[in-house]
Interface confidence: low
Amino acid sequence: SDKLYQRKEPVISSVHTKVKGIAEVTENVTEGGVTKLGHSIFDTADYTFPLQGNSFFVMTNYVKSEGQVQTLCPEYPRRGAQCSSDRRCKKGWMDPQSKGIQTGRCVPYDKTRKTCEVSAWCPTEEEKEAPRPALLRSAENFTVLIKNNIHFPGHNYTTRNILPTMNGSCTFHKTWDPQCSIFRLGDIFQEAGENFTEVAVQGGIMGIEIYWDCNLDSWSHHCRPRYSFRRLDDKNMDESFVPGYNFRYAKYYKENNVEKRTLIKAFGIRFDILVFGTGGKF
Amino acid sequence: SDKLYQRKEPVISSVHTKVKGIAEVTENVTEGGVTKLGHSIFDTADYTFPLQGNSFFVMTNYVKSEGQVQTLCPEYPRRGAQCSSDRRCKKGWMDPQSKGIQTGRCVPYDKTRKTCEVSAWCPTEEEKEAPRPALLRSAENFTVLIKNNIHFPGHNYTTRNILPTMNGSCTFHKTWDPQCSIFRLGDIFQEAGENFTEVAVQGGIMGIEIYWDCNLDSWSHHCRPRYSFRRLDDKNMDESFVPGYNFRYAKYYKENNVEKRTLIKAFGIRFDILVFGTGGKF
Amino acid sequence: SDKLYQRKEPVISSVHTKVKGIAEVTENVTEGGVTKLGHSIFDTADYTFPLQGNSFFVMTNYVKSEGQVQTLCPEYPRRGAQCSSDRRCKKGWMDPQSKGIQTGRCVPYDKTRKTCEVSAWCPTEEEKEAPRPALLRSAENFTVLIKNNIHFPGHNYTTRNILPTMNGSCTFHKTWDPQCSIFRLGDIFQEAGENFTEVAVQGGIMGIEIYWDCNLDSWSHHCRPRYSFRRLDDKNMDESFVPGYNFRYAKYYKENNVEKRTLIKAFGIRFDILVFGTGGKF
């Protein structure tokens, strides 16, 4: 509450997160022209990345383009990309949607379609939909431990969200355990009024707000965090503004002395931990 | 503008960026003693890294040290590093400029020069100038989409920089399209009065400031961002303080059961998105 | 000091860090059943990661699980994980502490112990203590250069912590050189009243606070940073809340067409650079 007589000071904050959970992924794997069902296990080293404290990312879905090499190949025949003669292809042109630089030749992509040839990582990434349901949809049951250390330098006051009395096997609940700092990802979404299973397909950004409203006067001292959750990306966003949350990264390797890469388009949830609040003292 | 009767509150912000563009890189490649011109294509997975929302990095130049292995070798003969006898070399010494730990022996580096032998990743990195012009100088034409979600918790007000009416094929222009949030990297530099081609060689840090001056009173409501740009690194910095922006990372692999790495010294532009402003309400 | 007549404005900040140093690591390496002493050199590309400006990480210790492959194997026999019959193992169950998904079978882990079989990256990670003393304990002698650019947009004032007059071979000292922005990691810990050697084992989080108290009035202009240091993680934290600072990451590779990984549990110090302060002007 606003105490006008107090000297207010914004919070200085540091955050540390730790995600736990294992996902079993079942997907169609094609090898040597034969498609079979593949099972794999993803643990934290597979689905999350060492990021800064105030953000963490959990991969919930992906599309792989395996064994790409740098060469010439027909570009992917997305809408408006097909050609019938070389006139349609402009040497040196880089279409922002494309994945390479045109050579000026119109070449066969498959039996029925021709596209402009490009210098690129080949074969070029197929522009296919993210798998539905999401491959790591079970990430809904992962948990995250959030440690938050705060400081009001002007008041020379430091505290943290985890107290010695807390139980390490708790799970946050708005009513039953509002001070527990271990959160089930699915619960975060539920609290924010969002559907994890749906968001997991294309990815998204979820805000975990930690609000510290601290009264540092000794006679009415109070300084504990309040957690709230809200979705930060725009779920109604137009296709052209790239809805959801994804990024591409590559694993490079050499095979028979040829430099290759596997391109992974990773969809997932980026969780932003937004710490704010003030410390007031007479 | 300052309305003294209003209750002001700082902005809580979350940022998401998406870089687009392809670079064609031509460089001399030496294989088996033969030097020839190599062409390669760099796409987002090759030149950018999955970073936090409020920063993104675009590699514009690089120096590679390929096939390094952990062993003993002469250190690089930079200024003041040459020796004529073992007396000049101190066993166990780590020169901060060097890349290894001295063994105490003075050994031939090439036909004419001797340096202290070191235990290091060998051959040690050559301290050569960053290529000029920069290898990915065409990054000037890359674009970045910036999505910014802001919140004034005290006023329970949320908005974002991208509105449903916006056109996904726009490009920011200070005069003609100041609300478009797709920025050409070269334009950012031009607005900041900097030369992209020049900065791309050594790298640098560019600030994209997003200023929200929000009047949340219903009768005169206004809450839109203003973008401005300024260079954050010191272009006149003394050599000893490491001018520009670069970092080293490694790709590890095994060859004939020997652990090797390729060391990449990546130069580039780190873009920091600095969001600030206040929301005022009666 | 508080000048009530001044218009105060919070600082907008950008940070760039550069770590220097080499560590020699000696550890027992087992190959083909034979254990021998292995020496290796770690340089910046090996022990640090390209992170955001306001945080950097230095690996001080690690535990490796080499040559893991996705298959079925007995889980690690940690406290309470042993079994004597299949009844103790629940098909499809994921114990949060475990690294895989149970198959429902109880199988031999070694000559004397049986555990539940899991579908996982196998062999599963051994839950062994972090090496003591820390493998990269010599990181105490690494140095970090911190460049900080600040801006008070309302006052249209910009400055930085590194001045042209500064000497690039200085080292920060609270008394003798309080404006030098090159810090020895061990000194940071000493200033914060912490023992580097101890913290290096399990890892931790260290705050480097940069306080700008700027008087921008021309007649009494002052605007220089003050550095202070404090530990941000809780050294007395209960085991269940994951004391210290570590994360797991993986290096993936193919061997005889089988996808494998080396899992690294990296312990280290995350340094958070917390910039705060105000600029006041009449």
């Epitope: 395996e66 790409q68 060469t71 074969p123 028979n256 | - | -």
Partner: nanobody
Framework: EVQLVESGGGLVQAGGSLRLSCAAS????????MGWLRQAPGKEREFVSG????????YYADSVKGRFTISRDNAKNTMYLQMNSLKPEDTAVYYC?????????????????WGQGTQVTVSS
């Protein structure tokens, strides 16, 4: 590992024809994009013609368009190059090559499997 063996080379008069074959073993042939390349004395290896995995798409260097025809028979694990209207400048060692990652071979890059080559000499 894939083994590729070329055959059908030889000496021929300008204007004549030759048919080269490339027999593959060791991997599912239909999973490889295949191509023909050649190297004349003192020159770099150059691309001649390429064919997709299924054989439905073909590609030719400008210098051989209309004269050479590439084809493959996946049932027989063999690729062919029918060379008509041969010219002295077609003299070279002809190599067959394959790639498990390309959908079609379009130049000399990205090829992992190579044959030993077969000599074609065109006299004037």
């Amino acid at each position: 590992e894939v083994q590729l063996v070329e055959s059908g080379g030889g000496l021929v008069q300008a204007g004549g024809s030759l048919r080269l074959s490339c027999a593959a073993s060791g991997r599912t042939f239909s999973s490889l994009a295949m191509g023909w390349l050649r190297q004349a004395p003192g020159k770099e290896r150059e691309f001649v013609s390429g064919i997709s995995r299924g054989g439905t798409s073909t590609y030719y260097a400008d210098s051989v368009k209309g004269r050479f025809t590439i084809s493959r028979d996946n049932a027989k694990n063999t690729m062919y190059l029918q060379m008509n209207s041969l010219k002295p400048e077609d003299t070279a060692v002809y190599y067959c090559a394959g790639s498990p990652v390309l959908s079609i071979v379009l130049d000399t890059r990205g090829l992992e499997y190579w044959g030993q080559g077969t000599q074609v000499t065109v006299s004037s």
